[in-house]
Interface confidence: low
């Protein structure tokens, strides 16, 4: 390609400008440029677009349907980490905040029409996790931090006065209403990055035009890490039906029994009064908000394929390198999906010794090439061992039994689960499946921790101990609906004390 020489660049300074080649002149044809922002641990990347004008198809149906020129934004290394979004036309992408450590942009142009291009600025902000942080922050529906482009719906009422973008909690102009009131309809929020979801606040709405009130009395919750594989949130074996509003104005807060790790959230109304009208806030936090909980590179691609290995593998498509959390659509499958407990393992070499404080485990899809049936597999229980040199291994122990700790795994092939433990010094981490789904062993993984210098384990924590509870951060534990009037915040604000 003629225009691509020297148009790719890595950015490591605390702030900077990223522009299409030649900006402010029109960009050249036939470009494939990669811009990568690399942040040190504890730094959040904030990316803001100032100008954006790329060629687009006038017949383009939805956002992301870009045929000619486009900008892809990746959570991590391009084509390894998850795609955050594909952008073209003149609609400026909204502000992005990434705590993964790597944010990449790939810019593609074709041989024809050229436009003015884009100019963006980024800056890195120090994020010091609080030891006693509370995972109950409003995620941004009310404040606007969740941008309009992140909110969508199955349909919208035909008069254009009840759009998904009007579904913000305490929004003063109607709310979201589908074209037809039905329990097949949903409101969807893309949180862009993997996020802990701990609670949902809902309101109905009063029509500005008619003064009639509408509200959702109950709803189901669906979550997905990729926007394609969805899981309905369950209570036990049954789909959980959340009790919602009793009038059009009061806010009702539903706390989840346990935090859900997700990117996409769907609210699916089940019953309603007069008609469906919904305003919404989501509460939670990022995985990295907890101390020493950086994603160490499986998702982002910072950990190379060569650093991921396994006891065995089924075939290339489901090799260890496919075991990246979320970013892989498949996952790792061992050679024999139904192996003996403890026989198979997936290993990550972190490159240098780190302080490791947890893993995120996810199921996998694919795997059964004999029957051509797509297996949806996950690990129900697992053990973790670790090593500093790759030779001497220790299991994380259960302090009550002094035996290797048996961690709870997944209940679904797409929804990830975090399992935290006391800090361990490790360069190598192995996960041993012990029990698994009927479809066999299938796994994707991320390792959580921080640099060895950030959090040197004390003498006590160097031993193979683990807290008895697997999630040590103070998430809401009870599942309940609370009416909370004008303002829905978690009342316990002791998470941030003045010095």
């Amino acid at each position: 390609k003629t225009g691509s020489e020297d148009c790719s660049k890595n950015f490591t300074s605390p702030n900077g400008t990223i522009e299409s080649p030649g900006f402010p002149e029109k960009y050249p044809h036939n470009l494939d440029c990669t811009f990568t922002i690399l942040a040190k641990p504890k730094m959040e990347i904030i990316l803001q677009f100032l100008i954006f004008d790329l060629e687009h198809d006038p017949l383009q149906v939805g956002e992301g349907d870009c045929k000619y020129d486009w900008l892809d934004i990746w959570d991590g290394i391009p084509h390894v980490g998850p795609l955050i979004g594909k952008y073209c036309g003149t609609k400026t992408p909204s502000e992005l905040r990434s705590s993964t450590g790597i944010l990449s942009l790939t810019f593609h142009t074709d041989m024809a029409v050229a436009k003015d291009g884009f100019s963006a600025r980024y800056y890195l902000v120090h994020q010091e996790p609080l030891e006693n942080f509370q995972c109950n922050v409003p995620l941004g529906m009310e404040s606007g931090r969740i941008a309009n482009e992140q909110i969508s719906a199955s349909s919208t009422y035909s008069d254009g006065r009840w759009t998904p973008q009007q579904s913000r909690l305490h929004g003063d102009d109607n709310g979201w209403t589908p074209n037809l009131d039905s329990n097949k309809e949903y409101l969807q929020v893309d949180l862009r990055f993997l996020t802990m979801l701990t609670a949902i606040a809902t309101q109905g709405a009063i029509s500005r035009e008619t003064q009639n009130g509408y509200y959702v009395k109950s709803y189901k919750l669906e979550v997905s890490t990729n926007g394609e594989d969805w899981m309905v949130y369950r209570h036990g074996k049954n789909h959980k039906v959340f009790q919602a509003n009793n009038d059009a104005t009061e806010v009702v807060l539903n706390k989840l029994h346990a935090p859900l790790l997700t990117r996409f959230v769907r609210i699916r109304p089940q019953t309603w009064h007069s008609g469906i009208a919904l305003r919404l806030e989501l509460f939670g936090c990022r995985v990295t908000d907890a101390p020493c909980s950086n994603m160490l590179g499986m998702l982002s691609g910072l950990i190379a394929d060569s650093q991921i290995s396994a006891s065995s593998t089924q075939e290339y498509l489901w090799s260890p390198s496919a075991a990246r959390l979320v970013s892989s659509r498949s996952g790792w499958f061992p050679r024999i999906p139904q192996a003996q407990p403890g026989e198979e393992w997936l290993q990550v070499d972190l490159g240098t010794p780190k302080t490791v404080k947890g893993v995120i485990i996810q199921g996998a899809r694919g795997g059964d090439s004999i029957t051509a049936v797509e297996a949806r597999a996950f690990v129900r229980k697992f053990k973790v061992s670790y090593s500093l040199n790759g030779k001497d291994w220790e299991y994380i122990q259960d302090p009550r039994t002094q035996q290797p700790k048996l961690f709870e795994g997944n209940m679904h092939y797409d929804t990830p689960d975090i399992r935290r433990f006391d800090p361990i010094p490790a360069q190598y981490v192995r996960v041993y499946p012990e029990r698994w789904s009927p479809a066999g062993i299938g796994m994707r993984l991320e390792v959580l921790g921080c640099d060895w210098t950030d959090s040197k384990p004390t003498v006590e924590t160097l031993g193979p101990t683990v807290k008895s509870e697997e999630t040590t951060t103070p998430y809401p534990t009870e599942e309940e609906a609370t009416e909370c009037g004008e303002n829905c915040s978690f009342e316990d604000d002791k998470d941030l004390q003045l010095p």
């Epitope: 605390p14 702030n15 800056y123 902000v125 120090h126 010091e128 609080l130 409003p138 009310e142 404040s143 305490h170 003063d172 004008e486 303002n487 915040s489 604000d493 941030l496 003045l498 010095p499």
Partner: antibody
């Protein structure tokens, strides 16, 4: 201990420019936003603007936009507020203030002692 | 801009009295972004309460805050001599941040 120490009182003629300093200690100025607040005699508090020192990015209240410039010098851990085209109604005490770390756009936990600017012909 | 209206603008009270100051926002403010300051003559304001109801470090427990949406309250349960001052509410929910006009608490 966090401290913000401001420069001394100033007397200026209408049309002139005043530049007030705010030296911080006890923390790294780059980690904070530095805000400036005006208080006219016998009146309430009015936010003028702020600087994100690390990014050298400023935001100003519409009322002061065009007349106020906030800057910072990281080598001396000092922030500055310059107000130009002074008029008599600018006679006030000016405070620098900063939120607690980690709450950049929240409450002002620390304040300077204030600088009285008198505009008189 | 969000206007913050305090009432009363001044009040006279005696030591031991219970004092309530209200602050009304022109549009809804999340309780995480509503704060109170105390200012004594010739001094800089001092943070009293943050996030509607959390006492700043060193603030006596006779001070308390409450409210949500557009209506917020600062209460002094038993007024002490050192509490005679001017009190300001402050929102930083929407930019620009704004302050109430102040409530001067004087000795009766």
């Amino acid at each position: 201990e966090v401290q913000l120490v401001q420069s001394g009182a100033e007397v200026k003629k209408p049309g002139a420019t005043v530049k007030i300093s705010c030296k911080v200690s006890g923390f790294n100025i780059k980690d904070y936003y530095i805000h400036w607040v005006q208080q006219a005699p016998g009146k309430g508090l009015e936010w003028m603007g702020r600087i994100d020192v690390e990014d050298d990015e400023t935001k100003y209240a519409p009322k002061f936009q065009g007349r106020v410039t906030i800057t910072a010098d990281t080598s001396t851990d000092t922030a500055y507020m310059e107000l130009s085209s002074l008029r008599s109604e600018d006679t006030a005490v000016y405070y620098c203030a900063t939120p607690i770390y980690g709450s950049r756009e929240a409450w002002f936990a620390y304040w300077g002692q204030g600088t009285l600017v008198t505009v008189s012909s | 801009d969000i206007q913050m209206t305090q009432s009363p603008s001044s009040l006279s009270a005696s030591v031991g009295d219970r004092v309530t100051i209200t602050c009304t926002a022109s549009s809804s403010v999340s309780s995480s972004y509503l704060h109170w300051y105390q200012q004594k003559p010739g001094k800089a304001p001092k943070l009293l309460i943050y996030r509607t109801s959390n006492l700043a470090s060193g603030v006596p427990s006779r001070f308390s805050g409450s409210g949500s949406g557009t209506d917020f309250t600062l209460t002094i349960s038993s007024l002490q001599p050192e509490d005679f001052a001017t009190y300001y509410c402050h929102q930083y929910y929407r930019s620009p941040p704004t302050f109430g006009g102040g409530t001067k608490v004087e000795i009766k």
